[in-house]
């Protein structure tokens, strides 16, 4: 629980508690914003981001965004609050321990995004279909 000597300020989103009233600690995420990337046509890639940040707010999760257009490929790594859209998309997989890339519709580019909730989980971004729970065979395995 929140120790009595820690003041719980009004409207304080820096103190987030779990179901037991214990103070939730923040996520540790790769945080290099947007960088050029050589990640292309691979099942998974490392971010090559050397900066691991303590997310500012405990409710934030790790996010990675992979974008490819006619000119270049970029990879973005950040912390973000899953209650808020990112690049106009909801972070639907924020509770996942792995960053499983899902394609999003964006005109003029190929756009993949993932989010996850384990230490530095956006360092390893996974494109492979074998991890995608929209795969019916995998769903069979999960629910057996």
């Amino acid at each position: 629980t929140i120790p009595p000597h820690v003041q719980k300020s009004v409207n304080n989103d820096m103190i987030v508690t779990d179901n037991n009233g214990a103070v939730k600690f923040p996520q540790l995420c790769k945080f290099c914003d947007v960088r050029f990337s050589t990640c292309d046509n691979q099942k998974s890639c490392m971010s090559n981001c050397s900066i691991t940040s303590i997310c500012e707010k405990p409710q934030e999760v790790c996010v990675a965004v992979w974008r490819k257009n006619d000119e270049n490929i970029t990879l973005e790594t950040v912390c973000h609050d899953p209650k808020l859209p990112y690049h106009d998309f909801i972070l639907e997989d924020a509770a996942s321990p792995k960053c499983i890339m899902k394609e999003k519709k964006k005109p003029g580019e190929t756009f993949f995004m993932c989010s996850c909730s384990s230490d530095e989980c956006n360092d390893n971004i996974i494109f492979s279909e074998e991890y995608n729970t929209s795969n019916p065979d995998l769903l069979l395995v999960i629910f057996q």
């Epitope: 508690t17 779990d18 037991n20 214990a22 103070v23 939730k24 600690f25 540790l28 303590i54």
Partner: nanobody, 120 residues
Framework: EVQLLESGGGLVQPGGSLRLSCAAS???????RMWWVRQAPGKGLEWVS?????????YYADSVKGRFTISRDNSKNTLYLQMNSLRAEDTAVYYC?????????????WGQGTLVTVSS
């Protein structure tokens, strides 16, 4: 019973240095990730720095990068925070907190805090 006891706080002039200590007893200190967390008067918690159990991997908030250094001595069950180039905005109560990294998503143990005041 787990106890975390911070010390080393005090009044220091801007640009000065302080070294905080946090002594742990009755805990699984050597297996746990340790944190320094601060709370300025009337403000929320700020997660200042963290260190992995092995002591080799450290993390810092942007506001203290390059000025603060976290370390630990597992043989003494003690956590440290070396604070250099202190600024007025570093004034806060500093807490150490212990996180069981084997699946816990919340702070397991907290110290009582030590007050750092940066003022001329």
């Amino acid at each position: 019973e787990v106890q975390l006891l911070e010390s080393g706080g005090g009044l220091v002039q801007p640009g000065g240095s302080l070294r905080l200590s946090c002594a742990a007893s009755g805990s699984t200190f050597t297996d746990d990730r340790m944190w320094w967390v601060r709370q300025a008067p009337g403000k929320g918690l700020e997660w200042v720095s963290a260190i992995q159990p092995d002591g080799h991997t450290t993390y810092y908030a942007d506001s203290v990068k390059g000025r603060f250094t976290i370390s630990r001595d597992n043989s003494k069950n003690t956590l440290y925070l070396q604070m250099n180039s202190l600024r007025a905005e570093d004034t806060a109560v500093y807490y150490c907190a212990e996180q069981d990294v084997k699946g816990s998503s919340s702070f397991d143990y907290w110290g009582q805090g030590t007050l750092v005041t940066v003022s001329s």
